[in-house]
């Protein structure tokens, strides 16, 4: 083994949400570079509970664990936690092997890449390639809707995927309408769900090296009268320049015929609220859901006076729902303005 040869985990994608513990044997003096997540949102590396600094002989940097030259004290347990969520992306133990100067006739093939084929990948247990797309564990959907579960994965050799329902092999043969399995998309699709579809759905991803699994919970909601449901995040907070046009969007879902109003919050005699505790508002637009484009509020040629809080109010025979957003209007010459609006906020 040449001294320049490195221990690497590749490709550099975010691995499993339920990462299997790995052991890697590393020769003394050998450089190590282990990957954890994509560079722009990579994880942070910790050894025995302490975060690795971004500089030094052993460093955690932009999602990589780098050891310039492996020493006995570098052996131990290393964890990579996803930025912001503390989800374990990598969980591995580095074990000290023979030094680089010793014979390597019977070296562990898992410990490094074959120098005669520098572009071959080592065998690798399955891992999730897009764990962020799997964060929604509980799916509560109305009866009649379509449900799609995805478990995108990779590994070497390429793993296979199979599905379980409540712990039993699931092929959909007893399900009216059946199921669609799209192995190339690592997905399970069920159309027109009914209450009997409720349960725990497990994707099981396997190859010769190992297996990983992930559970989704499906709850099917039987349709019942309810007040209108407004799509989360709409209307969205918006920033605009004086003179520009603005569209505020409100998505309304309702079994019963809904009635929609767009309101602007106003101030009267220096107060935003009346004696009854309700806000002062001006009705800008009102219509039934089947009126054209009632779910969009158009504001043309906005001025500073248009800034403020706007509310989409939807009502039906059962009750009312509303969500609000803020419009910020900047002067034309403001050089700090960017088109990126902040995240939507909404009332409950």
């Amino acid at each position: 083994l040449e001294a320049s040869e490195e221990v690497e985990l590749e490709p550099c994608l975010a691995p499993s949400l339920e990462q299997q513990e790995q052991e890697l044997t590393v020769a003394l003096g050998q450089p190590v570079r282990l990957c954890c997540g994509r560079a722009e949102r990579g994880g942070h590396w910790y050894k025995e509970g302490s975060r690795l600094a971004p500089a030094g002989r052993v460093r955690g940097w932009r999602g990589r664990l780098e050891i310039a030259s492996f020493l006995p004290e570098d052996a131990g347990r290393y964890l990579c936690l996803a930025r912001g969520s503390m989800i374990v992306l990598q969980n591995l133990t580095l074990i000290t092997g023979d030094s680089l100067t010793s014979s390597n006739d019977d070296e562990d093939p898992k410990s490094h890449r074959d120098p005669s084929n520098r572009h071959s990948y080592p065998q690798q247990a399955p891992y999730w390639t897009h764990p962020q797309r799997m964060e929604k564990k509980l799916h509560a959907v109305p009866a009649g809707n379509t449900v799609k579960f995805r478990c995108p994965a990779a590994g070497n050799p390429t793993p296979t995927i199979r599905w379980l329902k409540d712990g039993q092999a699931f092929h959909g043969e007893n399900r009216i309408g059946g199921i669609r399995l799209r192995h190339q998309h690592w997905s399970l699709v069920m159309e027109s769900v009914v209450p009997s579809d409720r349960g725990t759905y497990t994707c099981l991803v396997e190859n010769a090296v190992g297996s990983i699994r992930y559970n989704y919970l499906l709850d099917v909601l039987e349709r019942s009268p309810h007040r209108p449901i407004l799509q989360a995040g709409l209307p969205a907070n918006t920033t605009a320049v004086v003179g520009s046009d603005v569209e505020l969007l409100c998505k309304v879902y309702s079994d019963a015929q809904p009635h929609i109003q767009w309101l602007k919050h106003i101030v009267i005699n220096g107060s935003s609220f009346g004696a009854d505790g309700f806000p002062y508002v001006q009705v800008l637009k009102t219509a039934d859901i089947n009126s054209s484009e009632v779910e969009v509020l158009y504001l043309r040629n906005v001025s500073a006076e248009d800034a403020g809080e706007y509310t989409c109010l939807a009502g039906n025979s059962i009750g009312l729902s509303y969500q609000s957003a803020w419009l910020t209007v900047l002067p034309e010459e403001d050089p700090t303005w960017t088109a990126a609006a902040p995240e939507a906020r909404y009332t409950d």
């Epitope: 936690l81 969520s85 503390m86 989800i87 374990v88």
Partner: antibody, heavy 114, light 107 residues
């Protein structure tokens, strides 16, 4: 309903030990990372320790490393904090907390134990 | 370790006022910053997560913005029930850390 309830607080002498417990209910305790946060009288919040759902991955603030041990029993839905070599400056309200949203924000807190 | 500097440490405002609190991180933490409200004798309550997302059930007068090292928390129209201490907290990496807090009261 989702809740965390801490117990085990009390008055002790410097140099002695105390164990706090935190019982979780209404959520899947075994899938959640659990934290301890403390607040000295009239002071701000201080993060102290985290234990991941595997029960073996622990992380500590420097101020308590080596003296405090976080642990959990998923079969009992309970989190623990073993506090040894206690000092006067450890006087505080101790909260257990978790992130049900999975995004690192503490969206569930216990009521605290002194 | 990441330090969070919160300012001001205390603040008096009138009902209906727009209130702004800032939080500065000692290094880039992307958008991994949360804001909490704590009333005397109570546990903290999450208001804003990931810099700008309003926690479910929190009134829309509360908002947050910022990314990298500089963050802002705003109450658009102060209400009497908003009297409390407010804390920022980073969850980019461990050890987690909180700002020193901002005590807000009514003039």
């Amino acid at each position: 309903q989702v809740q965390l309830v801490e117990t085990g607080g009390g008055v002790v002498q410097p140099g002695t030990s105390l164990r706090l417990s935190c019982a979780g209910s209404g959520f899947t305790f075994s899938e959640s990372g659990m934290h301890w946060v403390r607040q000295a009288p009239g002071k701000g919040l201080e993060w102290m320790a985290l234990i991941l759902n595997d029960g073996i991955s622990n992380f500590y603030a420097d101020s308590v490393k080596g003296r405090f041990t976080i642990s959990r029993d998923n079969s009992k839905n309970t989190l623990y904090l073993q506090m040894n070599s206690l000092r006067a400056e450890d006087t505080a309200v101790y909260y257990c907390a978790s992130s049900l949203g999975g995004n690192g924000a503490f969206d569930i807190w216990g009521q605290g134990t002194m | 370790d990441i330090q969070l500097t919160q300012s001001p440490s205390s603040l008096s405002a009138s009902v209906g006022d727009r209130v702004t609190i800032t939080c500065q991180a000692s290094q880039d933490i992307s958008n991994y910053l949360n804001w909490y409200q704590q009333k005397p004798g109570k546990a903290p309550k999450l208001l804003i997560y990931d810099a700008s997302n309003l926690e479910i059930g929190v009134p829309s007068r509360f908002s947050g913005s910022g990314s990298g090292t500089d963050f802002t928390f705003t109450i658009s129209s102060l209400q009497p029930e908003d009297i409390a201490t407010y804390y920022c907290q980073q969850h980019d990496n461990l050890p987690l850390s909180f700002g020193g807090g901002t005590k807000l009261d009514i003039k």
